[in-house]
Amino acid sequence: QGWQAFRNDATEVIPGLGEYPEPPPENNQTMNRAENGGRPPHHPYDAKDVSEYSCRELHYTRFLTDGPCRSAKPVTELVCSGQCGPARLLPNAIGRVKWWRPNGPDFRCIPDRYRAQRVQLLCPGGAAPRSRKVRLVASCKCKRLTRFHNQSELKDFGPETARPQKGRKPRPGARGAKANQAELENAY
């Protein structure tokens, strides 16, 4: 009886092990900046300059439902979101032929540890409360991806993180770049 059985009030399936939902965009752009101290305890990354290069533990508080029953208290759920940066894939081109060249291995921001939490569900019509155990993400980590991972697994990544296509050069290609653009930082 995992948490696949539960739904929140918006009928969004609470994710199970190995599922990584795409969270909505954040409004507070400074929330995870290092200087603001917004990092949760086991956060593997901290985007000092908010950018696409960030692996964040996003906290969501919501009620869980199972059929007509609803949790007595909201449950705080953690979702791992973002890219383990800096970008390690860069566009390259010779003439009209374009490919992605790697500058380093690809990492994915995924759950590291889980915690079990017992949730009491209140049911309508005077039915006895139910108790269920749910498994929630406790922390995130940046885990290595290989080129053999299914391309569809990367659907929630930005354009700079899609794996190179078959036609890419085996070694990184040579393409100049401007001297430092605005610095994009992460803390692992």
Epitope: P44, S51, Y53, C84, G85, P86, A87, R88, L90, R101, P102, N103, G104, P105, F107, K141, C142, K143, R144, T146, R147, F148, P170, R171, P172, G173, A174, R175, G176, A177, N180, Q181, A182, E183, L184, E185, N186, Y188
Partner: antibody
């Protein structure tokens, strides 16, 4: 010949900052991310972070919590590592290292290292 | 962070001996394990990557094996130039981490 040449030894007081440089030659600088690794006297190796010379994007070991900044200058093929608020336990040899790639095995490794820069923090 | 534990921390051996160094990861790291050799006052040098791939130019007496959490570096017949400290390094999860090192000394 591919090589990384680092700046000379530094002696700093606690609370000061140090900036170590690493000049790359023999390869296209922007093709490889540059990493920094340090080694305290008689101790093992500790990875500090990396920088992408193309974008300037950097990633750091959380242990250094905002004390470290890595930058590059592509016009001179030089990477820099600045460590602030130095403490006595930052006394170490600091290495820059290039991350090489084997396409067959899709694997990465530190294939070229600088000679190391000794940073001594002492009052 | 993934902890990399090397054993032994030091060993004494003679030229011609077979030497085995082990490295254990605190989590599964697949085959993303590299080995480096370091001599006093020098930078580390890559020997083996992806658990068992010998870097070009590294003598064939060096070999690596393992998968998951347990890895081994073997020197089949120790040579005078092999007396050094050896480090393993995982490349599976950020931050990258190294083992504490194994110092191979002359008996």
């Amino acid at each position: 010949e591919v090589q990384l040449v680092q700046s000379g030894a530094e002696v700093k007081k606690p609370g000061a900052s140090v900036k170590v440089s690493c000049k790359a030659s023999g390869y296209t600088f922007t093709d490889y991310n540059m990493h920094w690794v340090r080694q305290a006297p008689g101790q093992g190796l500790e990875w500090m972070g990396e920088i992408n010379p193309n974008s300037g994007g950097a990633g750091y070991n959380q242990k250094f919590k905002g004390r470290v900044t890595m930058t590059t200058d592509t016009s001179t093929s030089t990477a820099y590592m600045e460590l602030r608020s130095l403490r006595s336990d930052d006394t170490a040899v600091y290495y820059c290292a290039r991350l090489g790639y084997d396409d067959i095995y899709d694997d990465w490794y530190f294939d070229v290292w600088g000679q190391g820069t000794t940073v001594t923090v002492s009052s | 962070d993934i902890q990399m534990t090397q054993s032994p921390s030091s060993l004494s051996a003679s030229v011609g001996d077979r030497v085995t160094i082990t490295c254990r990861a605190s989590q599964d790291i697949s085959n993303y394990l590299n080995w480096y050799q370091q001599k006093p006052g020098k930078a580390p040098k890559l020997l083996i990557y992806h658990t068992s791939r010998l870097l070009s130019g590294v003598p064939s007496r060096f070999s690596g094996s393992g998968s998951g959490t347990d890895f081994t570096l073997t020197i089949s017949s120790l040579q005078p130039e092999d007396f050094a400290t050896y480090y393993c390094q995982q490349g599976d999860t950020l931050p990258y981490t190294f083992g504490g090192g194994t110092k191979v000394e002359i008996k």
